[in-house]
């Protein structure tokens, strides 16, 4: 099928158009013994010369000026459907005095190199050689759309053919499709759809959950404003042109919601005063997690039930809970939030702190000399239960004996029962400095402030005790 097309579709004058759904076979002289050759010009891509005429400076033996060289006019506009084949050519007659003429093909200002089906055929005569350069595409695609020209180089002159415009028509092609979105419930949002031909125009219909949204089509591009959704929906757009319709990908529009609680919580490590936990976040409710909250309460049924709350960033799903009591049981729950709100708290899990070394020293340390038995008696009060940080297994007593020129330190371990001890006098006429620390399986606590007592030489009597005051008694 051939038909003339009006010129204004493309810039520049050209003799006519061919609309075809088959390979156009142009009538060519078929000289016997033609020489097909693949010829590609080494010329660099560049703007073609305006016009298609060159007047060579070379003259014949008789110095007769040669006629101007020009490509013959050919079809100017070919319209065809995608995947069809097309063949077009340009021809020129060149006086035989010119050697090594090459024809190159250019598309939209760029030379076509490589694996294109370009064949140049030569038909020599007495004075001139007819050269026909054919270009064929077996299955056209949209990317083949454009303006094709031939270029010939003779004696550093460039001869340029008229353009041949190839217009590949097909189903609408999407240049912009709707995108998946996560939106707030009952909040308006926009979706965009854009498709192109040729052929134009392209009309757009919107589809929501398999039902058309607009009864009348909109010209591409189209923006759909959705006033708001209460539940998830799938949107797509249909693009129609004279060749048929193309449907975009379906995109899911999700409604943002509060997240689900974490699916796992792990107790990574426990110390006397801290617990390291990690968690696996639940479903994010289509909105990124912002932060998480760790709720901690004492598991002891007799506790007052108050909840400690520790806020942390959503990443890295890890938190060290600090300032906890030693050797205590805790219930822990984790909750995370996004822009919509907080998740429910995870199921409560149990975790325990370990035993620690006591955090305070024994109180009211008193030291006095029992001269009759040549002993030093020591008395104290055990640290407050809350600060024992475990089960007391005993005490460590440090006593340092200092007299002129000598100093020696001794350590004693005593059992947890009672709060007194007796140590033998090591040196007379010396100062004894006593310090006591409480001991649990978690370690040795801090030593008490030093208490000094003077041990006189034999025969002196001094029963006055030395002591450290209990807190608040000073």
């Amino acid at each position: 099928r051939e038909e003339a097309k009006p010129y204004p579709l493309f810039p520049g004058p050209f003799p006519g158009s061919l609309q075809t759904d088959h390979t156009p076979l142009l009538s060519l002289p078929h000289a016997s013994g033609y020489q097909p050759a693949l010829m590609f010009s080494p010329t660099q891509p560049g703007r073609p010369h305006t016009g298609n005429v060159a007047i060579p400076q070379v003259t014949s033996v008789e110095s007769k000026p040669l006629p101007p060289l020009a490509f013959k006019h050919t079809v100017g506009h070919i319209i065809l459907s995608e995947h069809k084949g097309v063949k077009f050519n340009c021809s020129i007659s060149v006086p035989n005095i010119y050697q090594d003429t090459t024809i190159s093909w250019w598309k939209d200002g760029k030379e076509l190199l490589g694996a294109h089906h370009a064949i140049t055929q030569f038909y020599p005569d007495d004075e001139v050689t007819a050269i026909i350069a054919s270009f064929s595409i077996t299955s056209v695609q949209r990317s083949d759309n454009g303006s094709y020209i031939c270029k010939m180089k003779i004696n550093n002159e460039e001869i340029v053919s008229d353009p041949i415009y190839i217009e590949v028509q097909g189903l609408p092609h999407f240049t912009k499709q709707p995108e998946s979105m996560n939106v707030t419930r009952n909040t308006a949002f926009n979706l965009t759809c854009q498709a192109v031909g040729p052929p134009e125009p392209v009309n757009i219909f919107w589809v929501q959950n398999s039902s058309r949204v607009n009864e009348q089509p909109e010209k591409s591009p189209s923006v759909l404003t959705v006033p708001g959704l209460t539940e998830m929906a799938v949107f797509s757009c249909e693009a129609h042109n004279d060749k048929g319709l193309t449907v975009s990908k379906g995109v899911q529009i999700n409604i943002k919601a509060i997240p689900s609680p974490p699916t796992e919580v792990s107790i990574r490590n426990s110390t006397a005063h801290s617990i390291l936990i990690s968690w696996v976040p639940g479903f994010d409710g289509y909105s990124p997690f912002r932060n998480c909250s760790i709720q901690v309460k004492e598991a002891d049924p007799l506790s007052n039930g108050s909840v400690m709350i520790f806020n942390t960033s959503a990443l890295p799903h890890l938190y060290q809970i600090k300032q906890l009591q030693a050797l205590a049981n805790y219930s822990i729950g984790v909750s995370c939030m996004n822009e919509i709100g907080w998740s429910a708290v995870s199921p409560w899990i149990l975790a325990s702190t370990t035993e620690g070394a006591p955090s305070v020293a024994p109180l009211n340390v008193t030291v006095f000399l029992n001269e009759s038995s040549d002993n030093v008696d020591i008395r104290w009060m055990k640290p407050p239960t809350k600060q024992q940080d475990g089960e007391l297994v005993g005490y460590r007593i440090s006593h340092v004996w200092q007299s002129a020129g000598i100093s020696k330190e001794l350590l004693e371990e005593v059992g947890q029962n009672g709060s007194r001890a007796r140590i033998s006098v090591q040196v007379h006429n010396a100062t004894c400095t006593v310090r006591i620390a409480a001991v649990t399986r978690g370690g040795v606590g801090p030593f008490s402030d030093p208490v000094k007592i003077f041990i006189p030489a034999h025969g002196w009597v001094d029963y006055a005790p030395s002591s450290t005051p209990a807190p608040g008694n000073a």
Epitope: T263, S266, I267, P347
Partner: antibody, heavy 128, light 111 residues
Framework: EQQLVESGGGLIQPGGSLRLSCAVS????????MSWVRQAPGKGLEWIGI???????YSASWAKGRFTISKDSSKNTMYLQMNSLRAEDTAVYFC??????????????????????WGQGTLVTVSS | DAQLTQSPSTLSASVGDRVTITCQSS????????LSWYQQKPGKAPKLLIY???DLASGVPSRFSGSGSGTEFTLTISSLQPDDFATYYC???????????FGGGTKVEIK
């Protein structure tokens, strides 16, 4: 839609091995612990083991050594490798999603809170 | 290993009846409440009914309720419906142990 589909069951001779698969859709194995449970014909449910989101596994004492749980998160599939099969292993094998799980890494154990989504099961018959 | 014992093992009842199933644990359940109830119909997979001893799973009718703590738990169906004839299992976990124990099951059948 969230779904679990077991496969790989069938007739197997005593002493043989079999690998069951549990294909997960609608949620990710990297965010949820998963479990295997079996049910002998006419009997009750029996827990086999669990694989946490990070890949740690815990098994019932009777299953240790013969049954191994693994997963391929890229395929969103969990597996149960069963070796040295016996007639008493004949059962329907279910995979189930663990709704919540607490792990005690330092002590190498973990506790299931609930199994909130189950597959339809696959029958394994061990017989000569 | 800890054990969960359900009673009765079989229960005959009529539509509209109030039904109670008990589940006793040989030691305290983790956190005293990490006990779940499952419903299973012949040839089908179990379905979660109740977790945390008393919380209803999503989509479960309100005629189902659970109670209990520590070692004693109860599942109650306030008014038995035709769709409720099935086998019910309790299950739970324990501190210091990965095992997830199931009760022996209670079959609720039509009287």
């Amino acid at each position: 839609e969230q779904q679990l589909v077991e496969s790989g069951g069938g007739l197997i001779q005593p002493g043989g091995s079999l690998r069951l698969s549990c294909a997960v859709s609608g949620f990710s194995l990297s965010s949820n612990a998963m479990s295997w449970v079996r049910q002998a014909p006419g009997k009750g449910l029996e827990w086999i083991g669990i694989i946490s989101s990070s890949g740690s596994t815990y098994s019932a004492s009777w299953a240790k050594g013969r049954f191994t749980i693994s997963k391929d998160s890229s395929k969103n599939t969990m597996y149960l490798q069963m070796n040295s099969l016996r007639a008493e292993d004949t059962a329907v094998y279910f995979c189930a999603r663990v709704g919540f799980f607490v792990g005690y890494g330092a002590y190498d154990y973990g506790i299931i809170h609930r199994l909130d989504l189950w597959g339809q099961g696959t029958l394994v018959t061990v017989s000569s | 290993d800890a054990q969960l014992t359900q009673s009765p093992s079989t229960l005959s009842a009529s539509v509209g009846d109030r039904v109670t199933i008990t589940c006793q644990s040989s030691k305290s359940i983790y956190n005293n409440n990490w006990l779940s109830w499952y419903q299973q119909k012949p040839g089908k997979a179990p379905k979660l009914l109740i977790y945390d001893a008393s919380d209803l799973a999503s989509g479960v009718p309100s005629r189902f309720s659970g109670s209990g703590s520590g070692t004693e738990f109860t599942l109650t169906i306030s008014s038995l419906q035709p769709d409720d004839f099935a086998t019910y299992y309790c299950a739970g976990g324990y501190s210091g142990d990965s095992d997830y124990a199931f009760g022996g099951g209670t079959k609720v059948e039509i009287k």
